[in-house]
């Protein structure tokens, strides 16, 4: 025998108190699938959270973060304070990156500059708190006489 509740569409619940008829979800609640025996409470985007998508009878609300904060976690479950480029967020707030590290975003941690010498390359542009170093050709490529390009032979003058 088919469960009568399976006929209840999204946006309703199967009301056992009313002979298993399909009742619409109460305000501020939703059911995203059919056949549910209760609706779910809508997520409320309060405080640092901002409503990105309103709750409807068939789908939950979606939140993002107010300016100066960014989402963390699945479905923006947390909002974390932004920092400036060249900083990272610590327990005591935003702190400048230590020498030898950088952060080119408003979130995340300071990361060490690339060690060019590990790849046998030289530093072309020094790193800053906001930017990684730029590695250039290897020192051997820059030494005199090491060039693989043969200079053109001098042109002979006519008649010689």
């Amino acid at each position: 025998l088919q469960d009568p509740c399976s006929n209840c569409p999204a946006g309703t619940f199967c009301d056992n108190n009313r002979n298993q008829i399909c009742s619409p979800c109460p305000p501020n609640s939703f059911s995203s699938a059919g056949g549910q025996r209760t609706c779910d409470i809508c997520r409320q985007c309060k405080g640092v959270f901002r409503t990105r998508k309103e709750c409807s009878s068939t789908s939950n609300a979606e939140c993002d973060c107010t300016p100066g904060f960014h989402c963390l976690g699945a479905g923006c479950s947390m909002c974390e304070q932004d920092c400036k480029q060249g900083q990272e967020l610590t327990k005591k707030g935003c702190k400048d990156c230590c020498f030898g590290t950088f952060n080119d975003q408003k979130r995340g941690i300071c990361r060490p500059w690339t060690n060019c010498s590990l790849d046998g390359k030289s530093v072309l542009v020094n790193g800053t708190k906001e930017r990684d170093v730029v590695c250039g050709p290897s020192p051997a490529d820059l030494s005199p006489g090491a060039s693989s390009v043969t200079p053109p032979a001098p042109a002979r003058e006519p008649g010689h």
């Epitope: 619940f13 108190n17 009313r18 009742s23 609640s29 209760t38 609706c39 779910d40």
Partner: nanobody, 122 residues
Framework: EVQLLESGGGLVQPGGSLRLSCAAS????????VGWVRQAPGKGLEWVSA????????YYAESVKGRFTISRDNAKNTLYLQMSSLRAEDTAVYYC???????????????RGQGTQVTVSS
């Protein structure tokens, strides 16, 4: 035991007004999320209005916004629905409803009363 007793319905001409009452017992209307649902002839239930978050916010269906007003009298433990500028499409049985929050996070509602019939016709 939770009981809800609706009254105040009747026959009214288009553009007219009615005030529905819901006398509650077995719970306190000021401490619960409560509202009104209706069922038009041959149609399913529809939420009309509710007082949510213990009075922190009110809800109105788009079809009744600006025409219906929900309120309550805590001393009388009674919920009201003031209906004005009534239209033929407001014809329905109106039920008082108590929103029920379940331990597992689910939401349903009780409509224990018999409802009160509102007929809008000339």
């Amino acid at each position: 035991e939770v009981q809800l007793l609706e009254s105040g319905g009747g026959l009214v001409q288009p553009g007219g007004s009615l005030r529905l009452s819901c006398a509650a017992s077995g719970f306190t209307v000021s401490a619960e999320d409560v509202g009104w649902v209706r069922q038009a002839p041959g149609k399913g239930l529809e939420w009309v209005s509710a007082i949510l978050d213990r009075g922190g916010s009110t809800y109105y269906a788009e079809s009744v916004k600006g025409r219906f007003t929900i309120s309550r009298d805590n001393a009388k433990n009674t919920l009201y629905l003031q209906m004005s500028s009534l239209r033929a499409e407001d014809t329905a049985v109106y039920y008082c409803a108590r929103v029920v929050y379940h331990a597992g996070g689910g939401v349903t509602y009780d409509t224990r009363g018999q409802g009160t019939q509102v007929t809008v016709s000339s």
